[in-house]
Each structure stands twice: as structure tokens, then as C-alpha cells.
């Protein structure tokens, strides 16, 4: 999922939904749909994002995000202060450096507001998760410098 | 090609039920939520539910709650639609319509099957 | 429910002319969620547009979306015969999905 700060219209596809999915809100439900998974990526130590698929929604739907570390003095529940959105709703969550400590269990749920006992909390170990990136420099790229993954070097040309 | 194809023409007696078949091919069928839309004769589109096969969880319109019910059969692809308790005033086309995977429009509609209630 | 009235009921026109059809929502409706569907005598509805703006894959850019809030608007630039039909719009931003009673272009 292809996550912004800005809001853009997105174009047509027919991509899947991978991940279930929000409890309606005029049907009589036999159970409660899970929540889109959250995956967490931390980038050189220097930010982390946290992104679910919010296309997996029914229908548009504002998720919250809340955090924590388990069993640690940063067991306090923080709230997202920096959402990233695509079509206009929330589908991640940008952590900057103070708020990633690393070496301890971060604890991340997601929240149907909508619907509060819809909610789904996940265990992440975040040294595994760390991605290292490379600066390109002004002559590769042709002019600006961009943050650039390893994964990505020998494509940063499309950039 | 990708495309949703539906059950053929039913006439029905008030009281009765049907059930309209929509077989999808092409695309991943659990992956995008199926939408069920009719339109009376000579009428406008009124959205009626969804599945989702990935998980069969189902949303109906608060009109057609207690009459409608959606369950699809994920091993032969296929989204069903049984409507109970049929009046002269569900004749109607009934389609099955694709959600978007990324964003919430119907982006690939089934032919429609005629729905025909009379006594 | 968010109800939507489109305008006019018919509009009579010839081929080459620019056709201008109005969709107005009862309450607000967030642009990426406005769509417009193309529907022909004994076919069911085809996308033309969603996100209030964007042209759907294979849509001939004579059509085009536009507005917000209450207020949108889907413009076919030069008529062609086959753009003679019957247009909706539809809301997809929240649940009841809903769409407008339809806008029927016929050939003058």
C-alpha cells in the first residue's frame, strides 16, 4: 500500500485485498471482522512507520493507531501524533527517533472508533524490523538527494 | 478475461425465494468484496449488501434485512444472492458488482439476471 | 443515508454538443468517494469515473468529473452516438453505498 502524507485519488486497479476487514455498521453481524494487519518498518534509526491496508476496509474508515512498550518505563499508551494517509483516511503512522527504542517489545494496536470493541493489538521485536539506507549522492539521482533503500539501489535511477 | 457471470432468467411466484449465482474468473476472488445491486424496471440502482469470500462476513441494507442473505463458495468461485418472501415489487435485475481493491467503487458488474415475481 | 438528486432528468441533445449532468449529495461527500456509471438499454452500468475526477481504464477523456462537498458535475465534452444512455452517480463513502435516480442523455 502506497501510503502519503498528502491525499491523492490513487488510480484504478484491480488490486486484492489482502487483509479482512471492519464490523459493518447497519447489518446485524454475526461476528466482528478483524482488523487490517499492521506491518512496521524502522528506516536507518531515524523514523518508523507503522501502515495497514486500509483498502481492506468495507467502506472508508478512519483506523487509530495507539503504542506502547511492554514491560519497559515507556509502557505509557501514546497516540499517533503523525498519521499517514491515501484516499483521504488514515493508513499509518510515522514514530520519529525519540519514540523508537529499539531493544524493547513495541506494542501497537489498531482501533475501529467507530466500533471501540474492535481492536487488535500486536507484539513487534523492532531490531528486526530496522531497514538501512543508503544516500545517493546529487550526481546519481541528477539534482536532489533522496533517502533511497538497499533494496531499491539499482532502480534509484527511476526515482 | 476477468468477469462475473450470472445465473439465467428466474420467474417467481409471490412468497417464494431465489437465488442468482455470480461466477467470477480472471481475478483473485477472495481478495475483493462482492456487492449485490438491482434496479425495478425502468428504475435507478439500489445497493442491496456485500460478501466478502475471503471470510464470508456479510453487511445488508437495513431494508432488505431478515430477506437477504449472500454466501458464496470459494472452492468453484462463485457469490450467491437468495432473496425470501419475494412480492411483485422485488421484479427486478439483479447484479453482482466487484469492489475496487483499492478503494470502495464497483469496478466490474455482472450482466444481471431478471428476477420476474408474479402470480 | 446520503441521498443524491441528479439533473436533469433528460437531457435532449445532438451529436457534437457538450453534455453537463449534476449530481447533488443531501450532506457532505469527501471527492474521492463520488462515482459516475454509464448504463445502456439492457446492460448493466460500466465506470466512467471515480474519485470524483479520475477516468476509470479505457474511458475516452471526452468524459470528465469534477466538484466537491455537494456539488458534482460529469461533462462529455463532444457527444458521440454511443454516449447516448443513461448516467448515475453513486457515493461509496459510507455505508448505505447510494447512488442518484439517473440522468437519461437522449439523441434531439
Known amino acids: 500500500l502506497n501510503t502519503t502524507i498528502l491525499t491523492p485519488n490513487g488510480n484504478e486497479d484491480t488490486t486484492a485485498d489482502f487483509f479482512l476487514t471492519t464490523m459493518p455498521t447497519d447489518s446485524l453481524s454475526v461476528s466482528t471482522l478483524p482488523l487490517p494487519e499492521v506491518q512496521c518498518f524502522v528506516f536507518n534509526v531515524e523514523y518508523m512507520n507503522c501502515t495497514w491496508n486500509s483498502s481492506s476496509e468495507p467502506q472508508p474508515t478512519n483506523l487509530t493507531l495507539h503504542y506502547w512498550y511492554k514491560n519497559s518505563d515507556n509502557d505509557k499508551v501514546q497516540k499517533c501524533s503523525h498519521y499517514l494517509f491515501s484516499e483521504e483516511i488514515t493508513s499509518g503512522c510515522q514514530l520519529q527517533k525519540k519514540e523508537i527504542h529499539l531493544y524493547q517489545t513495541f506494542v501497537v494496536q489498531l482501533q475501529d472508533p467507530r466500533e471501540p470493541r474492535r481492536q487488535a493489538t500486536q507484539m513487534l521485536k523492532l531490531q528486526n524490523l530496522v531497514i538501512e539506507q543508503k544516500l545517493i549522492s546529487e550526481e546519481d539521482l541528477g539534482g536532489e538527494q533522496k533517502l533511497i533503500s538497499e533494496e531499491d539501489l539499482h532502480h534509484h535511477h527511476h526515482h | 478475461q476477468v468477469q462475473l457471470v450470472q445465473s439465467g432468467a428466474e420467474v417467481k411466484k409471490p412468497g417464494a425465494s431465489v437465488k442468482v449465482s455470480c461466477k467470477a474468473s480472471?481475478?483473485?476472488?477472495?481478495?475483493?468484496?462482492m456487492h449485490w445491486v438491482r434496479q425495478a424496471p425502468g428504475q435507478g440502482l439500489e445497493w442491496m449488501g456485500w460478501?466478502?469470500?475471503?471470510?464470508?462476513?456479510?453487511n445488508y441494507a437495513k431494508r432488505f434485512q431478515g430477506r437477504v442473505t449472500m454466501t458464496r463458495d470459494t472452492s468453484i468461485t462463485t457469490a450467491y444472492m437468495e432473496l425470501i418472501r419475494l412480492r411483485s415489487d422485488d421484479t427486478a435485475v439483479y447484479y453482482c458488482?466487484?469492489?475496487?481493491?483499492?478503494?470502495?467503487?464497483?469496478?466490474?458488474w455482472g450482466r444481471g439476471t431478471l428476477v420476474t415475481v408474479s402470480s | 443515508e446520503i441521498v443524491l438528486t441528479q439533473s436533469p432528468g433528460t437531457l435532449s441533445l445532438s451529436p457534437g454538443e457538450r453534455a453537463t449532468l449534476s449530481c447533488r449529495a443531501s450532506?457532505?461527500?469527501?471527492?474521492?468517494?463520488l462515482a459516475w456509471y454509464q448504463q445502456k438499454p439492457g446492460q448493466a452500468p460500466r465506470l466512467l469515473i471515480y474519485g470524483a475526477s479520475s477516468r476509470a481504464t479505457g474511458i475516452p477523456d471526452r468524459f470528465s468529473g469534477s466538484g466537491s462537498g455537494t456539488d458534482f458535475t460529469l461533462t462529455i465534452s463532444r457527444l458521440e452516438p454511443e454516449d447516448f444512455a443513461v448516467y448515475y452517480c453513486?457515493?461509496?463513502?459510507?455505508?448505505?453505498?447510494?447512488f442518484g435516480q439517473g440522468t437519461k442523455v437522449e439523441i434531439k
Open positions: 450532506q457532505s461527500v469527501s471527492s474521492s468517494y
Open positions: 460478501i466478502y469470500p475471503h471470510s464470508g462476513h456479510t
Open positions: 480472471g481475478y483473485t476472488f477472495t481478495g475483493h468484496y
Open positions: 453513486q457515493q461509496y463513502g459510507s455505508s448505505p453505498w447510494t
Open positions: 458488482a466487484r469492489r475496487s481493491g483499492r478503494s470502495w467503487y464497483f469496478d466490474l
